[in-house]
Amino acid sequence: EVEKTACPSGKKAREIDESLIFYKKWELEACVDAALLATQMDRVNAIPFTYEQLDVLKHKLDELYPQGYPESVIQHLGYLFLKMSPEDIRKWNVTSLETLKALLEVNKGHEMSPQVATLIDRFVKGRGQLDKDTLDTLTAFYPGYLCSLSPEELSSVPPSSIWAVRPQDLDTCDPRQLDVLYPKARLAFQNMNGSEYFVKIQSFLGGAPTEDLKALSQQNVSMDLATFMKLRTDAVLPLTVAEVQKLLGPHVEGLKAEERHRPVRDWILRQRQDDLDTLGLGLQGGIPNGYLVLDLSMQEALS
C-alpha cells in the first residue's frame, strides 16, 4: 500500500496528461483524483507511464470501485488491463462487444492470458450464448479459441454462429468438440446446394456420423485424405469399399500411405480382402475370402 501523504502545493492534477509521468508514485497517489482518472481513462493509454505508476493508477480505481469497474472505465483501460488479475475481472460486467475488442487489442499477438480467458468467460456468460459477432471477434484474435472450449461450453453456440467459423479455427479441436459442433454446422448449412454444402461442412466432418458420410459418398465430393484421417473411426467402419472409393474419388490412392494409421487401419480390418483388392492399391489385412467374422458382442448376447 502506498502511504497516504498530502499532495504538494500546486501539484494537484486538473487533468490526466503527460506531466504526470514526472510524478513519483506517492505524488500520483496523493495528487490524482480517482474520479478524474475514471472520467479521463482514455488518455492514460497515450501517456508512457511506468509499470509502477500504472500500479498506483490501478490502486486508485480499485478504491473508487471496490465492487468492480463500470463498463465506461473498462472500455478505456488500455494497457492498464494487463495489470488486472482474474479476480479483478470477475467483478466486471462487460456487455459491449466494443469493450471486448478494445481489451483484446491490448493483448494482441500474445497467448491467451488468464486475464483474457476470464474476460471472455464473463462476456460470453453475460450474453448467454456465443453469438456470431462474438465468435467472429474471438476467432479473429485467437484462431484456436473455439477448440479451447469444453464440449459443454460449445453446446451454447447457436447454429447461426457457425457461419463465423473458418477452417483454421478448428485445427486443434478434438473429436469430442467436433461431435458437438458438427450437428450445428449441418443445421447451419443445410439450405445450401450439395457442392457448396460440402465445402462449408468439410472442416467439421470429424464429428460426422456414418449416415452422413454415406450420403457424401453419393455426391462425388472427392474428400482429401487429411479430412478422411480426421473422421471418427466408429463412423468410418460401416463404410463399404465402394463408398470409400466414391467418397475419396481420385484421393483414394492415398489410403496406401495411411494403411497403418487410424481410421484406415481399423477400416481395412473390417473389409473383405477381395473387396479391398478391387481398389488395386495393395491394401492388406482384410478378412480372407470364405472366413466368418465373429462379433464378440454377439457371442456374449447369444450365450
Epitope: 449441418r186 443445410q190 439450405n191 450439395g194 454444402y197 456414418t210 449416415e211 452422413d212 454415406k214 450420403a215 457424401l216 453419393q218 455426391q219 467402419l237 460401416p238 463399404t240 473390417r270 473383405r272 458382442s297
Partner: antibody, heavy 122, light 107 residues
Framework: QVQLVESGGGVVQPGRSLRLSCAAS????????MHWVRQAPGKGLEWVAA????????YYADSVKGRFTISRDNSKNMLYLQMNSLRAEDTAVYYC???????????????WGQGTLVTVSS | EIVLTQSPDFQSVTPKEKVTITCRAS??????LHWYRQKPDQSPKLLIK???QSFSGVPSRFSGGGSGTDFTLTINSLEAEDAATYYC?????????FGQGTKVEIK
C-alpha cells in the same frame, strides 16, 4: 419440430389409381431424401420407394416398379406417391418417412408420418 | 433382393429380463443393418443404426451387434414400455428390406 402428414388414402377398386401426398414441415425439406414405406394390416413393414433431396434419383421396390411413381415439390414441401394399376396386395397403411442423412438416400430416420390407409377392393 | 429373417417371431418376457432378437441376412450386408421398434398404432422408431450405433435419445438398455450376415438386438433389462414389434432393416443394397418382425409381449 419435424412433422410429416400423409393424405389421399381411401378405398379404390383394383386396376384404378390413387395419389398420396405427404406435407412436410419443421425442417429444410429440400435438403433431405424421402421415402414411402407401407404396412399391410397385421403384417410387417415394406419399403416402397425413395427419392433424392432434389428429385434427381428415384428407387422402387420390385413389387411396385412400373406401377408407382415417387415425386416431390420442394417449393411446396410436398412428397407424392402416384399409384397406378392398384392390386389387392397394395392394401396397407402408407407412411412417408424422412431420411436420417442430409443430401442422400441412406437410412430411414426416426421421422415418420402417422400413415394413411389405402384399401384396394372391388 | 436381400431377405432378412428374424428369430423368434414372438417372445413373452417378464420385466427386467434380458431379451435377444437375432436377424440373419441372405447375403453379407456389412454393417448396414438397423433396428426399429413399433408400438401398437404408432409409426416405427429407430433404435440402433449400423448394427451397433445407438440412436440419440434411445435408452442404454438397447444394444446391437454383429456384421456381415448375423446380427442381434439386445434389451438388457426389459421394461413394460418395451412391449412392441421389433424389426431389422437393411439399407446395404436396393431394394431395401425389413425382417418379418419379432413381437415382444410382457408377461
Amino acid at each position: 419440430q419435424v412433422q410429416l402428414v400423409e393424405s389421399g388414402g381411401g378405398v379404390v377398386q383394383p386396376g384404378r389409381s390413387l395419389r398420396l401426398s405427404c406435407a412436410a414441415s419443421g425442417f429444410t425439406f429440400s435438403s433431405y431424401g424421402m421415402h414411402w414405406v407401407r404396412q399391410a394390416p397385421g403384417k410387417g413393414l415394406e419399403w416402397v420407394a425413395a427419392i433424392w433431396y432434389d428429385g434427381s434419383n428415384k428407387y422402387y421396390a420390385d413389387s411396385v416398379k412400373g406401377r408407382f411413381t415417387i415425386s416431390r415439390d420442394n417449393s411446396k414441401n410436398m412428397l407424392y406417391l402416384q399409384m397406378n394399376s392398384l392390386r389387392a396386395e397394395d392394401t396397407a397403411v402408407y407412411y412417408c418417412a424422412r431420411d436420417l442423412s442430409i443430401f442422400g438416400v441412406v437410412i430411414l430416420s426416426d421421422y415418420w408420418g402417422q400413415g394413411t390407409l389405402v384399401t384396394v377392393s372391388s | 433382393e436381400i431377405v432378412l429373417t428374424q428369430s423368434p417371431d414372438f417372445q413373452s418376457v417378464t420385466p427386467k429380463e434380458k431379451v435377444t432378437i437375432t436377424c440373419r441376412a441372405s447375403q453379407s450386408i456389412g454393417s448396414s443393418l438397423h433396428w426399429y421398434r413399433q408400438k401398437p398404432d404408432q409409426s416405427p422408431k429407430l433404435l440402433i443404426k449400423y448394427a451397433s450405433q445407438s440412436f440419440s435419445g434411445v435408452p442404454s438398455r438397447f444394444s446391437g451387434g454383429g456384421s456381415g450376415t448375423d446380427f442381434t438386438l439386445t434389451i438388457n433389462s426389459l421394461e413394460a414400455e418395451d412391449a412392441a414389434t421389433y424389426y431389422c432393416h437393411q439399407s446395404s443394397s436396393l431394394p431395401w428390406t425389413f425382417g418379418q418382425g419379432t413381437k415382444v409381449e410382457i408377461k
